[in-house]
Amino acid sequence: LRLLDHRALVCSQPGLNCTVKNSTCLDDSWIHPRNLTPSSPKDLQIQLHFAHTQQGDLFPVAHIEWTLQTDASILYLEGAELSVLQLNTNERLCVRFEFLSKLRHHHRRWRFTFSHFVVDPDQEYEVTVHHLPKPIPDGDPNHQSKNFLVPDCEHARMKVTTPCMSSGSLWDPNITVETLEAHQLRVSFTLWNESTHYQILLTSFPHMENHSCFEHMHHIPAPRPEEFHQRSNVTLTLRNLKGCCRHQVQIQPFFSSCLNDCLRHSATVSCPEMPDTPEPIPDYMPLW
């Protein structure tokens, strides 16, 4: 978790002098509770936006927006703590809006936004906005949270972001798999424009079951430049096991930008349809 272009962070708006600060996610008001605390944020909204760094890279960011409730506690609002927790790693990053002037009611509802948390493809985050100071131990909570899932690199808008392109999102191998006679599969896919090797991982399963009955790995050496964007054809020999008929073919590239961690593409061949067995015809017809 990180912030995009930290020096450009702004939270001031007409009628409010405000500064964005790094936060330890442990506000002072936890340790030194105040008697009077503000109410919780209203109408927390999170969207996926895209932002360029000064180097021209494009990153997905969480756009966080919320409004203030129109009650008197606005007079005791000193700021807000924004927290983003990545759920699979428990990594947390916080920033603090510090209000340098007192808020006053005005004709429009106060609205705040922040779009600088860089998020990763296919990750889920808990996004929390805490009004400050935080409540006393038995006080009503004054925060709002939402769990936000970022689309993966298959998503059309994500595909062109720097992290997705680095993991090979622009490569479309257009895999085709056909079953040949004599227990063989022909796998065909389009090579990318990089001199790097590939690996084909074949996993076979029985019909309607999810434990594998055959596994095989096939190495494809790095293509020469004249072979870039050409089709590569590989014939794989299957184990002659009755009922081991559903095959998943996965192609793993080893591009320089992502090495062992590139996006994999896969295709599946289903078991052949079994024809309905007709009722056996008796060879004699009983008379009674």
Epitope: Q45, E124, P151, A156, R157
Partner: nanobody
Framework: QVQLVESGGGLVQPGRSLRLSCAAS????????MHWVRQAPGKGLEWVSG????????GYADSVKGRFTISRDNAKNSLYLQMNSLRAEDTALYYC???????????????????WGQGTLVTVSS
């Protein structure tokens, strides 16, 4: 312009099933999370279910969990709601709605739903 058209509502007996459909047009359907929201007679709006852009994540309101199934077919620009074991309290106008921004929030919407259908009426009565 964005259009969402629901269909499949009707009068059904308690315990029976219905399948609602929503045909979408005017936007890139497979970019966005989609939702079903309902409004019972004389009540406010209630979020029913949501589905992420690629069907990878799905959420349901507690009141319909285990009975309703949301799905989508991006090739057909369509959203569906399979409703089983219907109860009288499921009687409502059912709306299909599009998430305003990209991304998906479990257990509800990430923010505003910026486009809505006209609704399809589901009446559960014996």
């Amino acid at each position: 312009q964005v259009q969402l058209v629901e269909s499949g509502g009707g009068l059904v007996q308690p315990g029976r099933s219905l399948r609602l459909s929503c045909a979408a047009s005017g936007f890139t359907f497979d970019d966005y999370a989609m939702h079903w929201v309902r409004q019972a007679p004389g009540k406010g709006l209630e979020w029913v279910s949501g589905i992420s852009w690629n069907s990878g994540s799905i959420g349901y309101a507690d009141s319909v969990k285990g009975r309703f199934t949301i799905s989508r077919d991006n090739a057909k620009n369509s959203l569906y709601l399979q409703m089983n074991s219907l109860r009288a309290e499921d009687t409502a106008l059912y709306y299909c709605a599009k998430e305003k921004g990209l991304g998906y929030c479990s257990g509800g919407t990430c923010g505003d739903l910026d486009n809505w259908g006209q609704g399809t009426l589901v009446t559960v009565s014996s």
